[in-house]
């Protein structure tokens, strides 16, 4: 039994790290393999993760970690029974993939403005709580080419856009994701999307801005 692609891990920097790797051939990950991990610290327990299959030869493991600090370092040992297949280490703060934002809501009753709000997925005592910025994706349900991304580079989990920038009488969807620049993180997964109907009507004058000239012969 051989490891083809060594484990690579990402952390949500609150409680969960996810490691993925590929084996040399078809493997029943949960029956044949164990990933043992331990925080390098005075008082730390040895933890064991039972991997799941991710394709025929791919394995994925969800590592539970507590109360992370920036200096944390974990030893990782991949075992097949009594055989040590791979040994490595993992520093969560250097491989951050934030949790996805939650509770995305679209308010359409603000005059001519769409207000999108969502919640920061971290509690206030977590380092990432004040570090996240966001990207909001809005798209037309019936026209995949009508899609745009808004970068929210401030920390407030809200976005205001003019309803007039979207097509009238069309259903739109939005989703949001997060990243932490200061930790050089990757983007989070997208949040679940939310749907609304853009009922905004353009002012009458905009429809009739051209003038009719009558010529007399």
């Amino acid at each position: 039994m051989k490891v083809l692609q060594e484990p690579t891990c990402v952390s949500d920097y609150i409680s969960l790290s996810t490691c993925e790797w590929k084996m040399g051939g078809p493997t029943n990950c949960s029956a044949e393999l164990r990933l043992v991990y331990q925080l390098v610290f005075l008082i730390s327990e040895t933890n064991m993760c039972v991997p799941e299959n991710n394709g025929a030869a791919g394995c994925v493991c969800h590592l539970f970690m507590e109360d992370m600090v920036g200096a944390d370092n974990y030893t990782l040992d991949l075992w097949a029974g009594q055989q040590l297949l791979w040994k490595g280490s993992f520093k969560p703060s250097e491989h951050v993939k934030p949790k996805a934002p939650e509770n995305l809501t679209v308010y359409t009753n603000v005059s001519e403005t769409l207000l999108l709000t969502w919640s920061n997925p971290y509690p206030p005592d977590n380092y990432l709580y004040e570090k996240l910025t966001y990207a909001v994706n809005i798209w037309n349900e019936n026209d995949p080419t009508d899609s745009r991304i808004y970068d929210v580079t401030y920390q407030e989990p809200t976005l205001r856009i003019a309803a007039s920038t979207l097509k009238s009488g069309v259903s739109y969807r939005a989703r949001v994701r997060a990243w932490a620049q200061s930790y050089n993180s990757t983007w989070s997964e997208w949040s679940p999307s939310t749907k609304w109907y853009n009922a905004y009507k353009e002012p009458f004058e905009k429809h009739h801005h051209h003038h009719h000239h009558h010529h007399h012969h």
Epitope: I43, G70, A71, D72, S93, D125
Partner: antibody
Framework: EVQLQQSGADLVRPGASVKLSCTAS????????MHWVKQRPEQGLEWVGR????????IYASKFQGKATITADTSSNTAYMQLSSLTSGDTAVYHC?????????WGQGTLVTVSA | DILMTQTPLSLPVSLGAQASISCRSS???????????LEWYLQKPGQSPKLLIY???NRFSGVPDRFSGSGSGTDFTLKISRVEAEDLGIYYC?????????FGGGTKLEIK
């Protein structure tokens, strides 16, 4: 052996500031959160705040916001807490504690007495 | 802020008897990672507090097995099965799940 050695007792005037220190031995403070806990004479324990010494990220109980400032120097393995604009209500023993992820190691405490 | 209410304030016990201390939180203290960071500390006169129990039920290393923790949600209990003279002091519960972290008011265990 794991130890948290705190600075000695301090007698300070009302309105002044004081900076308490807490030096760790037997472990690296970067591997834990460093907390401070207040204990007024003959009273209970009150959580003040904490720091992650790796990145300096601090969080405080709201009543100590503006009163306490927690810092850390990883090169000397020391955590600090500065208390400002002292009043008689700040007279207490202040404990530094490392938490990972519970309060396993406590300093001996520093008595701060505020008196004219 | 989460209020941690301990009862009784004072607990007179005979040596060898069982003692029970209650701690009630004003709201759930389950952390977003699923753990309940409810701890018990003992402070003896002139000393700093010492950890007895973490995550509701786990005894810290070196803590005698006569100490046990139980509970869930908002109600927690520390039991000492056979009180010894060295157990005297003030017991504090503590929640480390939600900022600001908070201690209970303390229960003084004394000899009857």
């Amino acid at each position: 052996e794991v130890q948290l050695q705190q600075s000695g007792a301090d007698l300070v005037r009302p309105g002044a500031s004081v900076k308490l220190s807490c030096t760790a031995s037997g472990f690296n403070i970067k591997d834990t959160y460093m907390h401070w806990v207040k204990q007024r004479p003959e009273q209970g324990l009150e959580w003040v705040g904490r720091i992650d010494p790796t990145n300096g990220y601090t969080i405080y109980a709201s009543k100590f916001q503006g009163k306490a400032t927690i810092t850390a120097d990883t090169s000397s393995n020391t955590a600090y807490m500065q208390l400002s604009s002292l009043t008689s209500g700040d007279t207490a023993v202040y404990h530094c504690v490392s938490r990972r992820p519970w309060f396993a190691y406590w300093g001996q405490g520093t008595l701060v007495t505020v008196s004219a | 802020d989460i209020l941690m209410t301990q009862t009784p304030l004072s607990l007179p016990v005979s040596l060898g008897a069982q003692a029970s201390i209650s701690c009630r939180s004003s709201q759930s203290i389950v952390h977003s990672n699923g753990n309940t960071y409810l701890e018990w500390y003992l402070q003896k006169p002139g000393q700093s507090p010492k950890l007895l129990i973490y995550k509701v039920t786990n005894r810290f290393s070196g803590v005698p097995d006569r100490f046990s923790g139980s509970g869930s949600g908002t109600d927690f209990t520390l039991k000492i099965s056979r009180v010894e003279a060295e157990d005297l002091g003030i017991y504090y519960c503590f929640q480390g799940s939600h900022v600001p972290y908070t201690f209970g008011g303390g229960t003084k265990l004394e000899i009857k």
